[in-house]
C-alpha cells in the first residue's frame, strides 16, 4: 500500500515500512529526475552531433537557462541554507517553461519527457514545504514565458536540437549541483 | 496503487547464497524506481540497492561486489541477488517502490534472512 508523502505508516506490525523522510524522498525525487534526463539525452545524442559541439559553440547560445552562482549559497565555500534553497526553487520554477519546450521534441522517448516534466513539478512542492522564506521565491511571469516558448518554437531544425540538448545539459548540471547543497541541508 | 510481495528469504549459512524476489502489481511498474532496504533489530533501516527505470544500479558499500539488483519490466519484478553472505546481513529485507511522478513510495512487509552457522 502507498505511503503518502509526510505520513506514518499505520502497519505497527512493520517497524520498516516507517515512510521516507522529507531529505530522502527529495534525495530520491532528484535522481528520479536525473534518470529520466539521462534517457532523453541518449536520444538526442543519437539523433544529432549536438553532443559534440565545443563548448563555445554552446556558450553563444542566448538562452538565460538557471545556473547556480558563488553568491547563490549552494557552493561548500559560501554555504548559505536559505538563501541556496530559494535559489534552488526559483531555479526549478524557471526550467519549467524549457521544460514544457521539450514536450514535443522527442520521438521514443515521449514518455521520459513527460517523466522529467511531472516530477519536477513534485519536486518543486516538496521544496516548498521545506521553505520558510516562501517570499523571497519569484515565480516566472506566464506572459514572458509564453512569448519565450513561442520564440523557441520558431527556431529552425539546427536551432531546437541545440536548444534540446543546452536545457537537457543545463538542467542536470542544476540538478546535480541542487542534489549535493540539499544533502548539505 | 502499488502491492509489492517480497520472497526467497530464509536461513542460509555463511558463505552462502540466497535471491530475493519483489512481485509488484499495478500497471506503471516500467516508471517506478525500485530499491531493497533491510532493517535488523534495534538498528537504523539501511539502503541496499537500488535500480532505476532505466536499469542504472547502486549498491550500498557494505554490500559491493556481493549483493546485484536487477528487473524485469515485462514480468514487474526486481532481484535481489545475495552472494557471499555475512551474520551482520542478517534482517528483514524491503523491497520499496519510488514514482517520481506522484513522489508516493510504496513498500513491501518483508522477508527475513538470516545468516548463521
Known amino acids: 500500500a502507498p505511503v503518502p508523502p509526510g505520513e506514518d505508516s499505520k502497519d505497527v506490525a512493520a517497524p520498516h515500512r516507517q515512510p521516507l523522510t522529507s531529505s530522502e524522498r527529495i534525495d530520491k525525487q532528484i535522481r528520479y529526475i536525473l534518470d529520466g534526463i539521462s534517457a532523453l539525452r541518449k536520444e538526442t545524442c543519437n539523433k544529432s552531433n549536438m553532443c559534440e559541439s565545443s563548448k563555445e559553440a554552446l556558450a553563444e547560445n542566448n538562452l538565460n537557462l538557471p545556473k547556480m552562482a558563488e553568491k547563490d549559497g549552494c557552493f561548500q565555500s559560501g554555504f548559505n541554507e536559505e538563501t541556496c534553497l530559494v535559489k534552488i526553487i526559483t531555479g526549478l520554477l524557471e526550467f519549467e517553461v524549457y521544460l514544457e519546450y521539450l514536450q514535443n521534441r522527442f520521438e521514443s522517448s515521449e514518455e521520459q519527457a513527460r517523466a522529467v516534466q511531472m516530477s519536477t513539478k513534485v519536486l518543486i512542492q516538496f521544496l516548498q514545504k521545506k521553505a520558510k522564506n516562501l517570499d523571497a521565491i519569484t515565480t516566472p511571469d506566464p506572459t514572458t514565458n509564453a512569448s519565450l516558448l513561442t520564440k523557441l518554437q520558431a527556431q529552425n531544425q539546427w536551432l531546437q536540437d541545440m536548444t534540446t540538448h543546452l536545457i537537457l545539459r543545463s538542467f542536470k548540471e542544476f540538478l546535480q549541483s541542487s542534489l549535493r547543497a540539499l544533502r548539505q541541508m | 496503487a502499488v502491492q509489492l510481495v517480497e520472497s526467497g528469504g530464509g536461513l542460509v549459512q555463511p558463505g552462502g547464497s540466497l535471491r530475493l524476489s519483489c512481485a509488484a502489481s499495478?500497471?506503471?511498474?516500467?516508471?517506478?524506481?525500485m530499491d531493497w532496504y533491510r532493517q535488523a533489530p534495534g538498528k537504523q533501516r539501511e539502503l541496499v540497492a537500488s535500480?532505476?527505470?532505466?536499469?542504472?544500479?547502486m549498491a550500498a558499500d557494505s554490500v559491493k561486489g556481493r549483493f546485484t539488483i536487477s528487473r524485469d519490466n515485462a514480468e514487474n519484478m526486481v532481484y535481489l541477488q545475495m552472494n557471499s553472505l555475512k551474520p551482520e546481513d542478517t534482517a528483514v529485507y524491503v523491497c520499496?517502490?519510488?514514482?517520481?511522478?506522484?513522489?508516493?513510495?510504496?513498500w513491501g512487509r518483508g522477508t527475513q534472512v538470516t545468516v548463521s552457522s
Open positions: 520499496m517502490a519510488f514514482d517520481g511522478y506522484s513522489g508516493s513510495d510504496y
Open positions: 499495478g500497471s506503471i511498474f516500467s516508471r517506478l524506481a
Open positions: 535500480i532505476s527505470r532505466s536499469g542504472t544500479t
